[in-house]
Structure formats: structure tokens, C-alpha cells
């Protein structure tokens, strides 16, 4: 007769692990006994169990509660054996030795291989800023056994680093991205995808790319100076800038103190009817956490009348 | 052949404790299992619990949690440590030893009373 049993046998932390072992007789040939014993190199056996034909199941009591037979049909040539909730620390070599009669002992051995899958971690770096260098985004860390692959799936240009740390029964990895921040990073995803042969499916963990940045001010409603006229309602300026943090607005005017009347709603400059008052030098001043943007603009409120006696005045001149 | 002395039965107090003993002699090197098997009066004999030579062990459901059978290979003894005894404990108690040749029981002690009073 003969043993048949497997090489390796590969579970996931936490399952139960069927422990392979049958003996193929020739007729008239009986098994006798099972024992199961750990037998990691440098170690002497360490009994696991016993399956007796005629007395059943033995268990050591280091391993009370975790080692049952298959459940049935039995077939009285299988010792094959489950171990429950198998740990890190189970994973090792074990031997099966079956005693047979007439034809005597036979022994074989398998390594019990337990994945520790990962729960990845991912922390993001420092507070991103545009105008820095190189800087790093996020790190992200996964812990297991076998060693995790950990990797990036983004659209943002960036470059990344790797490191790994063995420990005694599995190992670490921390893979960190690096970019030089802009503004168009903005919103864009980031995400640390984590590969272990004990996922059913890769990790994966995003974060969400927030660069402080503040654009240049600029004013608009001034394109058309004619229309800026005594009498004129409803004239306004608007205060153009966009950045993250979204920026705070903060009107002032350079000549004196802003006209009665005048309307500050935000990033607008709201004017009553115009007089030749709200004539001068107005600043839009932005800010937010990361810096501030100043812009000026001068008006210069037309009075037609003025406009139309200069016109009367050159044609008589003419 | 296998010589099996048992000791340490004797009268004992439900909830109490006691502790058999058995030492082999003989043909040592051919026990498999160890085990302790009882009868009680008008009864079939039961095995209790056994033990393999690699410590292995199997208890009846009836002393789980309250037996402890223990072997020391090299001393050729095997001993039960009988704890929260009750009266349906009381039997006389049987050291016996397996032979690997045979694959059963084939050699027993004298026996050793148990009695367990409520």
C-alpha cells in the first residue's frame, strides 16, 4: 500500500485546515491507527492527534477543541483530520503516520501554510501646497504573510518608493507617493491598491488629493469705462480668484474709506446710482490659509454733461 | 506480557477529588494507548478515558471537564485525576494497556474501588 497526502497545503487565517491523509491498501490490508504530529526541523514531534480504529479520536490537549475528523461518510483507510481555526503558529511541517496490518507503518509529511491577509493602512503626508517640490502624498502600509504587493492606481503624475520589513512569521510593507503639487491635483483621487493571495480581491483605500493653492485677483467690470457715468444704476465690480481653501473677499478703497451706499456682498462691489464720489482707487484683497492675492483698479465716474460741453467747446474751436 | 498495579481508590464525597495511579512492567515496549477503563455493578464495562504514547487523549462524555488522564512514557505510569466526583462515578476502576500489535485492549490491571458517597 501507499500514502497519499499533499506537498502543501494553503488556508487562509482563521479557516479550518483539512490535514490530508489516506492510505491506499491492498485488499485485506487494515488501518490500525492515525497519529498526526508536528514535526518542524530543530523540534521534536509534537503529537497533534491520534484516530484510532476502534477507540476514535485522540486530541493533545495543546490542541484541545481544534482537531475533528472530516465529517462523515468516513472511510476507514482516511486519517485525514481538520484543524480548526488554524493561526500563524500552526503553519509548519506535520507528519501523518499510518499503522497498518498486515503491511506495517507509513508515514508521510505535508507544510501547513497559513495567509495572513493584510489590513492595509493609508496615511496621507504633509498638507499639500502649490509651489512646493517633491513632496509626499500619502503612504500606505499592509501587514501580512506572505509579503503583500502594495501599488498606486491614479491619474496624477507622481513617483513612488517602497520598503519592506520581515518580522518573524510575516511582513510589512510600506509604499509611499511622491508628487510635486499643482492645482489640477485637486480633487483627484489617490489610491493604494493592496495584492495578497489571501484577498479574495485586492484593497483598496483612496484618498482624495487637496492642494492649497491661491490664484491671481483680478477685477472685472471695468471693460467698458463710458459706461461708468453719473446716474448709472446697478454698476458693480466682481473680484475674480479661485483657490483651495475657497478664499475669503475684502473690498477697500485706497483714497478713503469705501463711499456711502456702496454694497460689499463677497466677491462683488455693489454701487447706488454713481456720482462723481465713486471715483477712485478700489482693492480687492483675497486670502485664504495658504496666502493672499491684492488687486486694484481705478474708477473714474464720467459726467456727460462735462464730456458734452468739451465737445461743444472744440467745435467752436474749430 | 504487560503487568498493569493500579492504586489510590478508595471512598470519596461527591464534589470530592482522588487520584488513581497504574504502573506498568513487562513488555513495556509494545503499549500503544494507555487507558482506564470502569464497571459498575450490573454494568458493562466502559472505557473512561485512553492516552497515546504522544499524549494524545480521549474522554468519555460523561467525565469531560472533570477527568484528567496523564502519561509519563518514561516512568511507564499513567495516572487520572478524578475531580467533581459524583455518585454515578462509583465503579471499580480498570488500568489497561494496548498493544501495537493488536490494536485493542489486551491487558489489564486488578481493578481498584471507587466509591463516591452523596
Known amino acids: 500500500g501507499e500514502l497519499e497526502t499533499s506537498d502543501v497545503v494553503t488556508v487562509v487565517l482563521g479557516q479550518d485546515a483539512k490535514l490530508p491523509c489516506f492510505y491506499r491498501g491492498d485488499s485485506g490490508e487494515q488501518v490500525g491507527q492515525v497519529a498526526w504530529a508536528r514535526v518542524d526541523a530543530g523540534e521534536g514531534a509534537q503529537e497533534l492527534a491520534l484516530l484510532h480504529s476502534k477507540y476514535g479520536l485522540h486530541v493533545s490537549p495543546a490542541y484541545e477543541g481544534r482537531v475533528e475528523q472530516p465529517p462523515p461518510p468516513r472511510n476507514p483507510l482516511d486519517g485525514s483530520v481538520l484543524l480548526r481555526n488554524a493561526v500563524q503558529a500552526d503553519e509548519g511541517e506535520y507528519e501523518c503516520r499510518v499503522s497498518t496490518f498486515p503491511a506495517g507503518s507509513f508515514q508521510a509529511r505535508l507544510r501547513l501554510r497559513v495567509l495572513v491577509p493584510p489590513l492595509p493602512s493609508l496615511n496621507p503626508g504633509p498638507a499639500l501646497e502649490e509651489g512646493q517640490g517633491l513632496t509626499l502624498a500619502a503612504s500606505c502600509t499592509a501587514e501580512g504573510s506572505p509579503a503583500p504587493s502594495v501599488t498606486w492606481d491614479t491619474e496624477v503624475k507622481g513617483t513612488t518608493s517602497s520598503r519592506s520589513f520581515k518580522h518573524s512569521r510575516s511582513a510589512a510593507v510600506t509604499s509611499e507617493f511622491h508628487l510635486v503639487p499643482s492645482r489640477s491635483m485637486n480633487g483627484q483621487p489617490l489610491t493604494c491598491v493592496v495584492s495578497h493571495p489571501g484577498l479574495l480581491q485586492d484593497q483598496r483605500i483612496t484618498h482624495i488629493l487637496h492642494v492649497s493653492f491661491l490664484a491671481e485677483a483680478s477685477v472685472r467690470g471695468l471693460e467698458d469705462q463710458n459706461l461708468w457715468h453719473i446716474g448709472r444704476e446697478g454698476a458693480m465690480l466682481k473680484c475674480l480668484s479661485e483657490g483651495q481653501p475657497p478664499p475669503s473677499y475684502n473690498w477697500t478703497r485706497l483714497d478713503g474709506p469705501l463711499p456711502s451706499g456702496v454694497r460689499v456682498d463677497g466677491d462683488t462691489l455693489g454701487f447706488p446710482p454713481l456720482t462723481t464720489e465713486h471715483s477712485g482707487i478700489y482693492v480687492c484683497h483675497v486670502s485664504n490659509e495658504f496666502s493672499s492675492r491684492d488687486s486694484q483698479v481705478t474708477v473714474d465716474v464720467l459726467d456727460p454733461q462735462e464730456d458734452s460741453g468739451k465737445q461743444v467747446d472744440l467745435v467752436s474751436a474749430s | 506480557e504487560v503487568q498493569l498495579v493500579e492504586s489510590g481508590g478508595g471512598l470519596v464525597q461527591a464534589g470530592g477529588s482522588l487520584r488513581l495511579s497504574c504502573a506498568a512492567s513487562g513488555s513495556i515496549s509494545s503499549i500503544n494507548l494507555m487507558g482506564w477503563f470502569r464497571q459498575a455493578p450490573a454494568k458493562q464495562r466502559e472505557l473512561v478515558t485512553s492516552?497515546?504514547?504522544?499524549?494524545?487523549?480521549r474522554y468519555a462524555d460523561s467525565v469531560k471537564g472533570r477527568f484528567t488522564i496523564s502519561r509519563d512514557v518514561a516512568k511507564n505510569t499513567v495516572d487520572l485525576q478524578m475531580n467533581s466526583l459524583k455518585p454515578e462515578d462509583t465503579a471499580v476502576y480498570y488500568c489497561?494497556?494496548?498493544?501495537?500489535?493488536?490494536?485493542?485492549?489486551?491487558?489489564w490491571g486488578q481493578g481498584t474501588q471507587v466509591t463516591v458517597s452523596s
Open positions: 489497561a494497556a494496548e498493544s501495537e500489535r493488536t490494536y485493542y485492549f489486551d491487558s
Open positions: 492516552i497515546s504514547p504522544g499524549g494524545s487523549v
